[in-house]
């Protein structure tokens, strides 16, 4: 029941893999709202192709918990981290001159797509196991922000605070439909 208001799970990082940021309250609509449908807004400074910009994708492996229950296996999650910059500058950008114009757009590294993954949760005291689908970040992107973006939008860009788009395959109009019926016809 707790998932509706808060993600009720401990941050249990596998030793040696660093600390994972605690997720935000889930019903904070401002924090979770994506702007522009995940597409970068038009801006006159859009001189470079987005592919020239890159941002850091950090992988964390940890167990997920739901109340007293813990995932049977660790799950690898992706966190979008750091400032965006031209890909060639990223490996050693510390100390470099700021490459964007002072009044130009700011670029932030945010989740782009997510995927759903089935997770089996084991519960203590002989309680029945649980099965859940967890939403995980699948990739990150650089999104242009300008000084005209409002404050609520700026809240979106801490790790794990902005909800990314679904991991949709490219589509001109309709998305492709899954044709394989075998799973349903021969289910379990």
């Amino acid at each position: 029941q707790g998932w509706q208001a808060f993600r009720n799970d401990a941050t249990e990082v596998i030793p040696g893999l660093g600390e994972y940021p605690e997720p935000p309250p889930e019903n904070n609509q401002t924090m979770n709202r994506a702007e522009n449908g995940g597409r970068p807004p038009h801006h006159p400074y859009d001189a470079k192709d987005v592919s020239e910009y890159s941002c850091r994708e950090l992988h964390y492996t940890r167990f997920l918990t739901d109340g007293p229950c813990r995932s049977a296996k660790p799950v690898t999650e992706l966190v979008c981290s750091g400032q965006c910059g031209p890909a060639r500058l990223l490996p050693n950008a510390i100390g470099r001159v700021k490459w964007w114009r002072p009044n130009g757009p700011d670029f932030r590294c945010i989740p782009d797509r997510y995927r759903a993954q089935r997770v089996q949760l084991l519960c203590p005291g002989g309680a029945a196991p649980r099965s859940r689908k967890v939403r995980l970040v699948a990739s990150c992107k650089c999104k242009r922000l300008t000084r005209f973006h409002n404050q609520s939008e700026l809240k979106d860009f801490g790790p794990e605070t902005a909800r990314p788009q679904k991991g949709r395959k490219p589509r001109p109009g309709a998305r492709g439909a899954k044709a394989n019926q075998a799973e349903l016809e021969n289910a379990y």
């Epitope: 993600r7 994506a34 649980r130 689908k133 899954k178 349903l184």
Partner: antibody, heavy 121, light 109 residues
Framework: EVQLVQSGAEVKKPGASVKVSCKVS????????MHWVRQAPGKGLEWMGG????????IYAQKFQGRVTMTEDTSTDTAYMELSSLRSEDTAVYYC??????????????WGQGTLVTVSS | QAVVTQEPSLTVSPGGTVTLTCGSS?????????PYWFQQKPGQAPRTLIS???DKHSWTPARFSGSLLGGKAALTLSGAQPEDEAEYYC?????????FGGGTKLTVL
């Protein structure tokens, strides 16, 4: 809070097509997994299809395969369900339903008000 | 295609307890079918009571609970109220394809 507002009632002739819309507010459509469910008068609920975030595709129920198309206009945050080759037995209330924005994936949490489609000659 | 079965109708006395079940033609219902339960009243859209077997929602009254029972998904109503009179549907997930049960008409009298 996700809110779904559907288009108005439609009357169609057999063999025609109908396109029902579902406008999302509160979140953007790309954040959500949209599904379509119908209910014939006095009958039960029937899943028609929807977006599966596990593989990033729209899946259709076998019964409707080839006759239904689910599309999205992300610029207006509107989802569409088009059903072709209508027959009298397609007379039903058509619902759009979407998941909740949360860490665990939960489908069918928010429902549109329904669109009555009547197929009659 | 899988067929999901429910009791067509059940009756419970006010304050009483009743269990609705949801079976699958493909065999035992497990947590990997992520059973959902919906309540629908006449002229209204359905509303979700339970997701993923037993997960209640903020709006779900405490008297409703979900579980697996004898190879089926189950919805138990303890302390039935007159306003619980409605149609109840279960839904099972078959690898991304969903199938609704035929519904159970619950009468409280």
């Amino acid at each position: 809070e996700v809110q779904l507002v559907q288009s108005g009632a439609e009357v169609k002739k057999p063999g025609a097509s109908v396109k029902v819309s579902c406008k999302v507010s509160g979140y953007t459509l790309t954040e959500l997994s949209m599904h379509w469910v119908r209910q014939a008068p006095g009958k039960g609920l029937e899943w028609m299809g929807g977006f599966d975030p596990e593989d990033g595709e729209t899946i259709y129920a076998q019964k409707f395969q080839g006759r239904v198309t689910m599309t999205e206009d992300t610029s207006t945050d509107t989802a569409y369900m088009e059903l072709s080759s209508l027959r009298s037995e397609d007379t039903a209330v058509y619902y759009c339903a979407t998941d909740t924005v949360g860490y665990w994936e939960k489908f069918f949490q928010h429902w549109g008000q329904g669109t009555l489609v009547t197929v009659s000659s | 295609q899988a067929v999901v079965t429910q009791e067509p109708s059940l009756t419970v006395s006010p304050g009483g307890t009743v269990t609705l079940t949801c079976g699958s033609s493909t065999g035992t219902v497990t947590i990997d079918h992520y059973p959902y339960w919906f309540q629908q009243k006449p002229g209204q859209a359905p509303r979700t009571l339970i997701s993923d077997t037993d997960d209640k929602h903020s709006w779900t009254p405490a008297r409703f609970s979900g579980s697996l029972l004898g190879g089926k998904a189950a919805l138990t109503l303890s302390g039935a109220q007159p306003e619980d009179e409605a149609e109840y549907y279960c839904l099972l997930d078959y690898g991304g394809r969903f199938v609704f049960g035929g519904g159970t008409k619950l009468t409280v009298l």
